[in-house]
């Protein structure tokens, strides 16, 4: 195989692979016909000038996960055929200015996970064919203006996880073919207007995990081809009107973990491909009418972990395909009876961990397909008659941790819960909070002894004896015409109380998604 070094393996397809900690210097002699050379997981610390002189046919050189800290200026001389070069996962702190001057046909250059502190303005000046440049995970404090000016063919650029705090507005001005730009995990606090204006072909822009506080109104207006925009975990407090109006192809947008206080009507411009919108972990206090009205294909809207105290009746207008609405862990005290009116396809709604004192009887009136409703940990004392009458698909209803007032007005709910016990799940059941004589007793199984027809709970109920939700028949309604003839507050007999099982599987986004 034309003199394969003893510490390497060589194939007749001119593939040379040298791996292992026992290798401390560049192996030689390398076979003259080598087309692919991989040097991986060695203890090589430096790359001298003369090691590649005889392998001019080399197309791919991968020197990854070594101890490489020093590269001589002429190390890559004579590698004019080289297309792919990876020096990732080494210990490089700086690169000689003219290191790459002889490899001007390079298509991919991977320099990720080194310790680079600076890039010289002329470092990449000859790379007109370069398509991919990876600089992720270095210590670059700033990007010099002009450093990318000659990379006219570049389609993918990763500058994530460096330390830079600002960008020059002209740094990307010649990258008209760029499709992927990753700037995540830096310390950017603001992005100058015009920074992305030249990037008409950009499809992915990753800005998550920076310190961005404000977005210029027209920041993305020239990026009509954007498909993925990641803005999560920044300090964004305000979305300027129209900020997203020119992004019709967007199919992934993350805004969770910011400081958003409000959303202006229609801020989310037409985005027919957007399926999910995650706005959890912000500081949103209210939702105006038509906040999401252009998102007619949206299926999941996550607004949990905000500070919502008011939702306008028309806030969810236009969300005709919404299937999942997460409003848990907010400060809601009241909801308008029409707030869900336009959500004809809603399947799951989570309202737990709020301060809801009551619900309008019509709140679920037009949401006939609801399957899960989470109402635990609110301030509910009762529910209106007939509130669940029409919800034939309801299979999961969580009502525990509310201060249920078990007087005669609770009877219709009590009766319905007995008949629909399986829908409450097997974790924690709703418990009476008042009057004092029944505090702590299960609302579901308490035996109510009033004059007139008695409603008996199961005699010795076992949680496991009830069928699971998925096999339970359609729900029996609380009749909105039930005449309550029973009276008195305190005539209850405690038949049995089930100890609550503290296994509360809060429906909604996963921990990873909803914080």
């Amino acid at each position: 195989y034309y003199g394969c070094p003893s510490e390497c393996t060589c194939s007749r397809a001119s593939q040379v692979e040298c791996t292992g900690a026992q290798i401390v210097a560049m192996p030689s002699p390398l076979p003259w016909n080598a087309m692919s050379l991989q040097i991986l997981n060695t203890h090589i610390t430096e790359l001298p000038e003369d090691k590649f002189l005889n392998i001019s046919a080399l197309i791919a050189l991968k020197m990854e996960k070594n101890e490489l800290a020093n590269i001589m200026p002429g190390a890559f001389r004579n590698l004019g055929s080289l297309r792919h070069l990876s020096l990732a996962n080494n210990k490089l702190k700086n690169l000689p200015v003219r290191l790459f001057q002889d490899v001007n046909n390079l298509e991919t250059l991977l320099l990720s996970n080194n310790q680079l502190v600076q890039i010289q303005p002329a470092q990449f000046s000859q790379f007109s064919n370069l398509k991919e440049l990876q600089l992720y995970g270095n210590n670059l404090e700033y990007i010099p203006e002009g450093v990318f000016d000659h990379l006219v063919g570049l389609t993918k650029l990763n500058l994530g996880n460096n330390g830079f705090t600002h960008l020059s507005p002209r740094v990307f001005q010649h990258l008209g073919n760029l499709q992927v730009l990753r700037l995540y995990e830096n310390r950017l606090s603001d992005i100058p207007m015009g920074t992305f204006d030249a990037l008409g072909n950009l499809q992915e822009l990753a800005l998550q995990e920076n310190q961005i506080g404000t977005l210029s109104p027209g920041l993305f207006h020239n990026n009509r081809n954007l498909q993925r925009l990641y803005l999560s975990n920044n300090h964004i407090s305000h979305l300027p009107p129209g900020i997203f109006m020119q992004l019709p192809h967007l199919n992934k947008l993350t805004l969770f973990g910011n400081s958003l206080k409000e959303l202006s009507p229609g801020v989310f411009g037409p985005m027919p491909n957007l399926r999910e919108l995650w706005l959890y972990n912000n500081h949103i206090t209210s939702l105006p009418d038509n906040a999401f009205s252009h998102l007619n294909q949206l299926q999941v809207l996550i607004l949990s972990h905000n500070q919502l105290s008011y939702i306008s009746p028309g806030a969810f207008n236009g969300l005709t395909n919404l299937r999942e609405l997460s409003l848990h862990t907010n400060a809601l005290q009241d909801l308008d009876g029409n707030v869900f009116r336009s959500l004809a396809n809603l399947r799951n709604v989570s309202l737990q961990n709020n301060r809801l004192r009551q619900l309008p009887g019509s709140i679920f009136a037009n949401v006939n397909g609801l399957m899960t409703i989470q109402l635990q940990n609110n301030n509910l004392e009762n529910l209106p008659l007939g509130i669940f009458d029409h919800l034939g698909n309801l299979c999961e209803l969580r009502l525990y941790d509310n201060p249920w007032r078990c007087d005669s007005n609770i009877l219709p709910l009590h009766d319905w819960l007995i008949l629909n016990r399986a829908r409450l799940g097997t974790d924690t059941l709703p418990v009476c909070s008042s009057p004092a004589s029944v505090r702590g007793q299960s609302l579901v199984i308490i035996n109510v002894n009033f004059p007139g027809p008695s409603v008996q709970g199961p005699e010795t109920p076992e949680v496991s004896s009830y069928p699971d939700t998925s096999s339970y028949p359609d729900s029996t309604s609380i009749s909105s015409t039930t005449e309550i003839t029973r009276s008195t507050d305190d005539d209850y007999t405690d038949l049995n109380t089930i100890e609550p099982i503290d296994d509360r599987n809060t429906w909604g986004m996963t921990d990873a998604q909803s914080g």
């Epitope: 499709q179 499809q203 299926q299 998604q513």
Partner: antibody
Framework: QVQLVESGGDLVTPGGSLRLSCAAS????????MTWIRQAPGKGLEWISD????????DYADSVKGRFTISRDNAKNSLYLQMSSLRAEDTAVYYC???????????????WGQGTMVTVSS | EIVLTQSPSSLSASVGDRVTIKCRAS??????LAWYQQKPGKAPKLLIY???SLESGVPSGFSGSGSGTDFTLTISSLQPEDFATYYC?????????FGPGTKVDIK
């Protein structure tokens, strides 16, 4: 270990219905999108549907839209595909797969089941 | 719908050969492309994601490159266990279409 196991494949007549199941183990099922892919005998792979991590968002290939329904039960670590109005061209091995994606550029079906055969024939 | 075409549809090669498979998208898909390997009677296995990133546990002899519309999977030195069918797949937009496959068999 991380695995997916499909079941429910059978021989069914045209116009009939079938429900496929996929049992997941070895990972936090509720953290991941899930997907169904099929492969007709001697043919290539066809993506047919996927579902978001909490079950809220779904999408379908045009070839099955209106006939197939994807669903999941995170409490049971299970994924389902309800198939109705079955046609001869639905004959295939059906795979469930974990759709792993993140905002760092990762996109891929990284865990696959072994597949279950569905035959639609009179 | 984005259409992916692969070339060649099949190829014959020997152990030790360098193999290149191309995948072309009908429109730009940035780098949202994956490559899979499938052996007869088995489920596919993810090799490459994000067009060029090697999935954990996959031998370093596999590499991917490209972005936009033209992508390449390279096997630098074909091993006996690499004889299989290879598929590309795009994640840029729904539906998540696959290429028709390239079968690599023994010469």
């Amino acid at each position: 270990q991380v695995q997916l196991v499909e079941s429910g494949g059978d021989l069914v007549t045209p116009g009939g219905s079938l429900r496929l199941s996929c049992a997941a183990s070895g990972f936090t099922f509720s953290d991941y999108y899930m997907t169904w892919i099929r492969q007709a005998p001697g043919k290539g792979l066809e993506w047919i549907s996927d579902i978001g991590s909490s079950g809220g968002s779904v999408d379908y290939a045009d070839s099955v839209k209106g006939r197939f329904t994807i669903s999941r039960d995170n409490a049971k670590n299970s994924l389902y595909l309800q198939m109705s109005s079955l046609r001869a061209e639905d004959t295939a091995v059906y795979y469930c797969a974990r759709y792993n994606w993140n905002d760092r550029g990762y996109d891929g079906f990284d865990i696959w089941g072994q597949g279950t055969m569905v035959t639609v024939s009179s | 719908e984005i259409v992916l075409t692969q070339s060649p549809s099949s190829l014959s090669a020997s152990v030790g050969d360098r193999v290149t498979i191309k995948c072309r998208a009908s429109q730009g898909i940035s780098s949202a492309l994956a490559w899979y390997q499938q052996k007869p009677g088995k489920a596919p296995k993810l090799l490459i994601y994000d067009a060029s990133s090697l999935e954990s546990g996959v031998p370093s002899g596999f590499s991917g490159s490209g972005s936009g519309t033209d992508f390449t999977l390279t096997i630098s030195s074909l091993q006996p266990e690499d004889f299989a069918t290879y598929y590309c797949q795009q994640f840029n937009s729904y539906p998540h279409t696959f290429g028709p496959g390239t079968k690599v068999d023994i010469k």
